[in-house]
């Protein structure tokens, strides 16, 4: 019979041959061969693989860093990751919580619309037209540009997000 | 690396005043914004004050206004919190942090004990 050029579900091609693949948990030791079933080893003590693999080696459990304000939400399995979460009061910098911070900043262009408390970070806004962010900041509110008509001066060069306006004298018409 | 080191702390009654120090080093201080934050017994962080790398703007939770005032001093690389008026309820680990507000610019506080 020909050799297979593709493999069923949960199997996988090797020397024209389709082997099986080993199950979450389990790492390859050996090749199937005409003869013998694919050899799977399960994962030690703090190592997984979550999918069905042919992989020789299993991952490293994530490692929590307190000294990052990282705790573990979820142990990890032969099967599963570990999950870090941060430490009460703080917030992950990212979905996969790498690190944690006490409160994340506003951009320049950004305002605080709410501080952050014990459970939730910062919330930011943009800064709507006539107002003006210009600093990264954990409380500061878009602030609104300078009126320069109320100080008797005339707008030299236009706000933006991030920057206020300039004001200057009044032209002078001369005589 | 950033220290971050707080001191001033210690047991005041009520009513009374302190004013609390963080002292940073290994890294600039001007510029930056400064938080003050406390941990009471039991209970979660709370955010007490902050002031703009400026110095130009500063915030205070409702729990502290009109009795805490922030302040900062960039000659000595050294922020400030005057407490007056202290009541029970202000007995916490008082921290100081800087931003980017990692736990690497994160002191290890100074305990204020408001008791008679």
């Known amino acids: 019979p020909e050799p297979p050029t593709a493999c069923r579900e949960k199997q996988y091609l090797i020397n024209s041959q389709c082997c099986s693949l080993c199950q979450p948990g389990q790492k390859l030791v050996s090749d199937c061969t005409e003869f013998t079933e694919t050899e799977c080893l399960p994962c030690g003590e703090s190592e997984f693989l979550d999918t069905w693999n042919r992989e020789t080696h299993c991952h490293q459990h994530k490692y929590c860093d307190p000294n990052l304000g990282l705790r573990v939400q979820q142990k990890g399995t032969s099967e599963t990751d570990t999950i870090c979460t941060c430490e009460e009061g703080w917030h992950c910098t990212s979905e996969a919580c790498e690190s944690c911070v006490l409160h994340r900043s506003c951009s320049p262009g950004f305002g605080v619309k709410q501080i952050a408390t014990g459970v939730s970070d910062t919330i930011c806004e943009p800064c709507p037209v006539g107002f003006f962010s210009n600093v990264s900041s954990a409380f500061e509110k878009c602030h609104p540009w300078t009126s320069c008509e109320t100080k008797d001066l005339v707008v030299q060069q236009a706000g933006t997000n991030k920057t206020d306006v300039v004001c200057g004298p009044q032209d002078r018409l001369r005589a | 690396e950033v220290q971050l080191l707080e001191s001033g702390g210690g047991l005041v009654q009520p009513g009374g005043s302190l004013r609390l120090s963080c002292a940073a080093s290994?890294?600039?201080?001007?510029?930056?914004e400064m938080w003050w934050v406390r941990r009471a017994p039991g209970k979660g962080l709370e955010r007490v004050s902050?002031?703009?790398?400026?110095?130009?703007?500063?915030y205070y939770a409702d729990s502290v206004k009109g009795r805490f005032t922030i302040s900062r001093d960039d000659s000595k690389n050294t922020l400030y919190l005057q407490m007056n008026s202290l009541r029970a309820e202000d007995t916490a680990v008082y921290y100081c942090?800087?931003?980017?507000?990692?736990?690497?610019?994160w002191g290890q506080g100074t305990l204020v004990t408001v008791s008679s």
């Open positions: 902050a002031i703009s790398g400026s110095g130009g703007s500063t």
């Open positions: 290994g890294s600039t201080f001007a510029g930056y």
């Open positions: 942090a800087r931003d980017p507000y990692s736990f690497d610019y």
